[in-house]
Amino acid sequence: VVSHFNDCPDSHTQFCFHGTCRFLVQEDKPACVCHSGYVGARCEHADLLA
């Protein structure tokens, strides 16, 4: 089974403001999985609709 994402490196602990960093294997770049109530590429915005 090929994983679609890896853990981000330690250097990226602050990459996501309110979320978890995942390194996308195919795109070869980091991305953020936002905590509940946050949105944005870096989970930097509070979700006003939540």
């Epitope: 853990d7 490196p9 250097s11 990226h12 294997v25 070869d28 770049k29 980091p30 870096r42």
Partner: antibody, heavy 115, light 106 residues
Framework: VQLQQSGAELVRPGASVKLSCTAS????????MHWVKQRPEQGLEWIGR????????KYAPKFQDKATITADTSSNTAYLQFSSLTSEDTAVYYC?????????WGQGTTLTVSS | IQMTQSSSSLSVSLGDRVTITCKAS??????LAWYQQKPGNAPRLLIS???NLKTGVPSRFSGSASGKDYTLSITSLQTEDVATYYC?????????FGGGTKLEIK
């Protein structure tokens, strides 16, 4: 997909200089951009990085007061600026972005500090 | 994180299988790159993620990982492979590089 760096610089001691690194084929906002130094006949040394999406920077301690890294997302370009240059700053400087499957390095900019 | 390349130089013969080793002082979870550099040239990225061969790099180059130990192998050394090789960790900041291993022909 590449990183294109500015041309060689010859500057006087005490002066300042700003080197550039323009990305094509990817968006610099996607990940951190880094700068690396290599003095003549020496190894490689990490200077620091920038998160182009928000301007946040991190530097190796020895470069904290020497280097300033900035980025302009509209031109997809990262910059490395030096102040109060000395002969110790004579080196080749590389910009780079690294992933797990791929990595990108500029061709390097030679900086010579000489009176 | 310290990266140690135990050999600063290796005396090799053309056609040899060459192994260059790099040891990390901490776990870096395969966030390791290998570079080839020839005098007057920029470092050339060979491998990222410990094992991923960059497009265009000959298949005689390969990378492997075992715990904190990383290896670059060249199956049959060619004249154009004579260079200095560096490892680099990019798991944590600051990024750190090994001191380099220079291949010299016997």
């Amino acid at each position: 997909v590449q990183l294109q760096q500015s041309g060689a610089e010859l500057v006087r001691p005490g002066a300042s200089v700003k080197l550039s690194c323009t990305a094509s084929g990817f968006n610099i906002k996607d990940d951190y951009m880094h700068w690396v130094k290599q003095r003549p006949e020496q190894g490689l040394e990490w200077i620091g990085r920038i998160d182009p999406a928000n301007g946040h920077t991190k530097y190796a301690p020895k470069f904290q007061d020497k280097a300033t890294i900035t980025a302009d997302t509209s031109s997809n370009t990262a910059y490395l600026q030096f102040s109060s240059l000395t002969s110790e700053d004579t080196a080749v400087y590389y910009c780079t972005r690294m992933g797990l499957r791929r990595g990108y390095w500029g061709q390097g900019t030679t900086l010579t500090v000489s009176s | 994180i310290q990266m140690t390349q135990s050999s600063s130089s290796l005396s090799v013969s053309l056609g040899d299988r060459v192994t260059i080793t790099c040891k990390a002082s901490e776990h870096i979870n395969s966030w390791l790159a290998w570079y080839q550099q020839k005098p007057g040239n920029a470092p050339r990225l060979l491998i990222s993620g410990a094992t991923n061969l960059k497009t265009g790099v000959p298949s005689r180059f390969s990378g492997s990982a075992s715990g904190k130990d990383y290896t670059l192998s060249i199956t049959s050394l060619q004249t154009e492979d004579v260079a200095t090789y560096y490892c680099q960790q990019y798991w944590g900041t600051p990024w750190t590089f090994g001191g380099g291993t220079k291949l010299e022909i016997k």
